[in-house]
Amino acid sequence: EEELQVIQPEKSVSVAAGDSATLNCTVSSLIPVGPIQWFRGAGPGRELIYNLKEGHFPRVTAVSDPTKRNNMDFSIRISNITPADAGTYYCVKFRKGSPDVELKSGAGTELSVRAKPSAPVVSGPAVRATAEHTVSFTCESHGFSPRDITLKWFKNGNELSDVQTNVDPAGKSVSYSIRSTARVLLTRRDVHSQVICEVAHVTLQGDPLRGTANLSEAIRVPPFLEVTQQSMRADNQVNVTCQVTKFYPQRLQLTWLENGNVSRTEMASALPENKDGTYNWTSWLLVNVSAHRDDVKLTCQVEHDGQPAVNKSFSVKVSAHPKEQGSNTAAENTGTNERN
């Protein structure tokens, strides 16, 4: 009597995550009578994958009808494969009994699963930093297999070199994750800049996956301040302007102080953008010189994006302007502001 053979023709099978895998198994003889079972792994810790007689195996189906008389094909199909399904699968013949006795195992078929990396997610610093400071961006992608992957960082199309990348876990696993940190030196021109994290993997059809972050979320460009006096008007009023230039973001509060006393407070809003993404703002104050005996110290105080206030002062020389007789009206503080 010829010895029963359990034939698993493929040593290895590779499938893409989400696809179905067919694991082939045939037996050389109908005798002895007894069931076939499929296991993943060998030894005492092996996992039952399919048993025709009992159990609920929603993703596993028999390729042929195993209840048919003279059936010798016990191949199975596993649907919706995930990286967690990777492993070596054994087709095992049992002799019918109470309990059934394991008779012979196939040589095993190694199932390898290729899985695409998830879309890279780029996150920037929690708080804004000013130009000439270095900030870190992090890029993460998960769930890919095999482990080999390349990750590159770009700022405005130029590859970044100050990068640290880790693929986890270090050892063998069903799937892997990558995490990379890039350090980026900010400049005042970076409001419109973008960093891109680019991930390439064998499963991607030639096009790397990209994650992006805008440096506008990470940068603060502090304003330049300039206070100037316009020429004296015929009505004895001096126009003093405070030019606040090249700042980002727009969140800005400007306060005029006359001799240390608050004269007017304004909030920037709906400013047009400069080409580089920054903003400018000009505010002015009309000072009635005839209302003052002494020189007037005007201060333009700017609080930008919650940072400590920046001041720029200017003295209006009252002695340089002729006083109106009997005039004792308060300084004008109803100036208008112009938004550039």
Epitope: R114, T150, A200, V202, T203, G206, D207
Partner: antibody, heavy 116, light 109 residues
């Protein structure tokens, strides 16, 4: 699933020539496609690929001698200024469904002869 | 660029023989290696991908092994239709470029 190359002919050195690879049974927007060549009696040589989105990538030796592009059903290889050394059979091929590391479907090839 | 060195460049064998062809990469390509069979005037045909996975429809007498830099294609029992030229092809996941070995011609002894 089928690939068929066309455009191979006898050409003059320096006169540009365009080869086409017409595909059927699948979408060019889903797979990387490649161009390869084989000089008479020699081995296979990789020229370049075009990604599913249409980005071309070339072998380091190409240096602008070839341009790969595609439409919805054809992939083209333009030989910009061919020399006699470009005489070969040119093959187009499609990468496998599991990844870009191998090519499972090939066209029969088209012969280009560059001669004065 | 990665170089692929295939050996031997040619061999003579008889039907039923076990044939082994090797391919060595100049640097590690992990398991990104494919084997093709080509007959005169025809396009290459994929036999093995990922170093050891048999492509569908390819007879089980063909097998591949190896990883890193050293790879082997084995034909366990040579058949008349197996007389052809065999090429290895690498893919490098960092440069994302392909390189072929120079080919091995299997002839009838």
């Amino acid at each position: 699933v089928q690939l068929v190359e066309s455009g191979g002919r006898l050409g003059q050195p320096g006169t540009s020539l365009t080869l086409s690879c017409t595909v059927s049974g699948f979408s060019l927007s889903s797979y990387v496609m490649g161009w390869f060549r084989q000089a008479p009696g020699k081995g296979l040589e990789y020229i370049g690929i075009i990604s599913s989105s249409g980005s071309p990538y070339y072998a380091s030796w190409v240096n602008g001698r070839f341009t790969i592009s595609k439409t919805s059903t054809t992939m083209d290889l333009k030989m910009n200024s061919p020399t006699t050394e470009d005489t070969a059979t040119y093959f187009c091929a499609r990468v496998g469904p599991l990844g870009v590391d191998y090519f499972n479907i090939w066209g029969p090839g088209t012969l280009v002869t560059v001669s004065s | 660029d990665i170089q692929m060195t295939q050996s031997p460049s040619s061999l003579s064998a008889s039907v039923g023989d076990r044939v082994t062809i090797t391919c060595r990469a100049s640097q590690s390509i992990n398991s990104y290696l494919a084997w093709y069979q080509q007959k005169p005037g025809k396009a290459p045909k994929l036999l093995i991908y990922s170093a050891s996975f048999l492509y569908s429809g390819v007879p089980s007498r063909f097998s591949g092994s190896g990883s890193g830099t050293d790879f082997t294609l084995t034909i366990s029992s040579l058949q008349p239709e197996d007389f052809a030229t065999y090429y290895c092809q690498s893919w490098h996941y960092i440069s994302r470029s392909y390189t072929f070995g120079q080919g091995t011609k299997v002839e009838i002894k």
